[in-house]
């Protein structure tokens, strides 16, 4: 049994780190492999993660953690029974992928404006809470040529779009993702998308 692509891990900077790797051939990850992890810290213990399959030769493991701070460093050991397949380390603060924003809602009852709101995926006491900026993707199912990214660089998880910039009488979808500038993170996954119908019509005298 051999590791084809070494484990690569990212942390949500809250309670879960996700490690993914590829094996040399088809593997029943949960039956054959264990990923052991231990914080380099006085009197820490070794914890075990049971991986899941992620495609034919891919495995993924979700490491449960108490929280994450900058000094934390983990040793990682990938075992197949009594055989050590790979040994490495992982510093969560240096490999952060934020959680995806949630509760994306579209408010169309605001005059002349489409208001999008969503929730910050972190509690206020988390370091990332005040560091997230967002990208909102809006596209049309009726007009394949229409797709826009709106960068939200302020802290408030809202975006206002003049309804007049969207075509009337067609449906749109929106989704949002996040990243944290000061932690040099990757982008989060996209939130689930939300659909709405743009019924806005310009006043008669402006037509």
């Amino acid at each position: 049994m051999k590791v084809l692509q070494e484990p690569a891990c990212v942390s949500d900077y809250m309670s879960i780190s996700t490690c993914e790797w590829k094996m040399g051939g088809p593997t029943n990850c949960s039956a054959e492999l264990r990923l052991l992890y231990q914080l380099v810290f006085q009197s820490s213990e070794t914890h075990t993660c049971v991986p899941e399959n992620n495609g034919g030769v891919g495995c993924v493991c979700h490491l449960l953690m108490d929280d994450v701070v900058s000094m934390d460093n983990y040793t990682l050991d990938l075992w197949a029974g009594q055989q050590l397949l790979w040994k490495g380390s992982f510093k969560p603060s240096e490999h952060v992928k934020p959680r995806a924003p949630g509760n994306l809602t579209v408010h169309t009852n605001v005059s002349d404006t489409v208001l999008l709101t969503w929730s910050n995926p972190y509690p206020p006491d988390n370091y990332l809470y005040n560091d997230l900026t967002y990208a909102v993707n809006i596209w049309s199912e009726n007009d394949p040529a229409y797709s826009r990214i709106h960068n939200v660089t302020y802290l408030k998880p809202t975006l206002r779009i003049p309804a007049s910039t969207l075509k009337s009488g067609i449906s749109y979808r929106a989704r949002v993702r996040a990243w944290a500038q000061h932690y040099n993170t990757t982008w989060s996954e996209w939130s689930p998308s939300t659909k709405w119908y743009n019924s806005y019509r310009e006043p008669f005298e402006q037509r």
Epitope: L39, Q42, S43, S44, E45, T46, M65, M71, D72
Partner: antibody
């Protein structure tokens, strides 16, 4: 009541061996790291050794490394210190103490909040 | 190893008066979770040590509020707001940041 009771001390000749025991009660023994601290006559406190709750990680002072072995039997709620190749300078009162909660991913520390009454080890010919 | 240095080594105090003991470490005891792994212990004559303060400033259960701890990084202080006769004994600081844990030399508090 949370309690630690040491035993096993006594008089031993240089080069000899002793095994100290520390019985814990009133708390979930397995969840906590444990520590041995000693005090030579008229001297201050000296840390000797620590062990994580699962027994998987052990730590020793340089002065005892290679001679002393810390271990634990969580089924008996008991901590041990096996002392070999004893020297005159090992003469001290030995205390066991309850250390950090080590079952969490990052152990949680509340100080060495419970101490045993101590057991006296005398190494002399 | 982290070296712990206490001062003064002897502290004669009048009952009712305040007392202060300093402890300095050779390297920072602050972990990035915001905690300083520094404790204070009192050992009364013929007794086992007892925990007074943990993580620099947290009073242990049952410890009178006249005892307080402060400091961060490498400089720490134990204060007794009003010394009582029962407070006599040896006071030790100890770092639990990493093994080997190390103690200060001890401060002997005595009543004038």
């Amino acid at each position: 009541e949370v309690q630690l009771v040491e035993s096993g001390g006594g008089l031993e000749q240089p080069g000899g061996s002793l095994r100290l025991s520390c019985a814990g009660s009133g708390f979930t023994f397995r969840d906590f790291a444990m520590t041995w601290v000693r005090q030579a006559p008229g001297k201050g406190l000296e840390w000797v050794s620590s062990v994580s709750g699962d027994g998987g990680n052990t730590y020793y002072a340089d002065s005892v490394k290679g001679r002393f072995t810390i271990s634990r039997d969580n089924s008996k709620n008991t901590l041990y210190l096996q002392m070999n190749s004893l020297r005159a300078e090992d003469t001290a009162v030995y205390y066991c103490a309850k250390d950090r909660l080590s079952v969490t991913v990052r152990p949680r520390y509340y100080g060495l909040d419970v101490w045993g009454q101590g057991t006296t080890v005398t190494v002399s010919s | 190893d982290i070296v712990m240095t206490q001062s003064p080594l002897s502290l004669p105090v009048t009952p009712g008066e305040p007392a202060s003991i300093s402890c300095r470490s050779s390297q920072s005891l602050l972990y990035s979770n915001g905690y300083n792994y520094l404790d204070w212990y009192l050992q009364k004559s013929g007794q086992s040590p007892q925990l007074l303060i943990y993580l620099s400033s947290n009073r242990a259960s049952g410890v009178p509020d006249r005892f307080s701890g402060s400091g961060s990084g490498t400089d720490f202080t134990l204060k007794i707001s009003r010394v009582e006769a029962e407070d006599v004994g040896f006071y030790y600081c100890m770092q639990a940041f990493q093994a080997p844990y190390t103690f200060g030399q001890g401060t002997k508090l005595e009543i004038k």
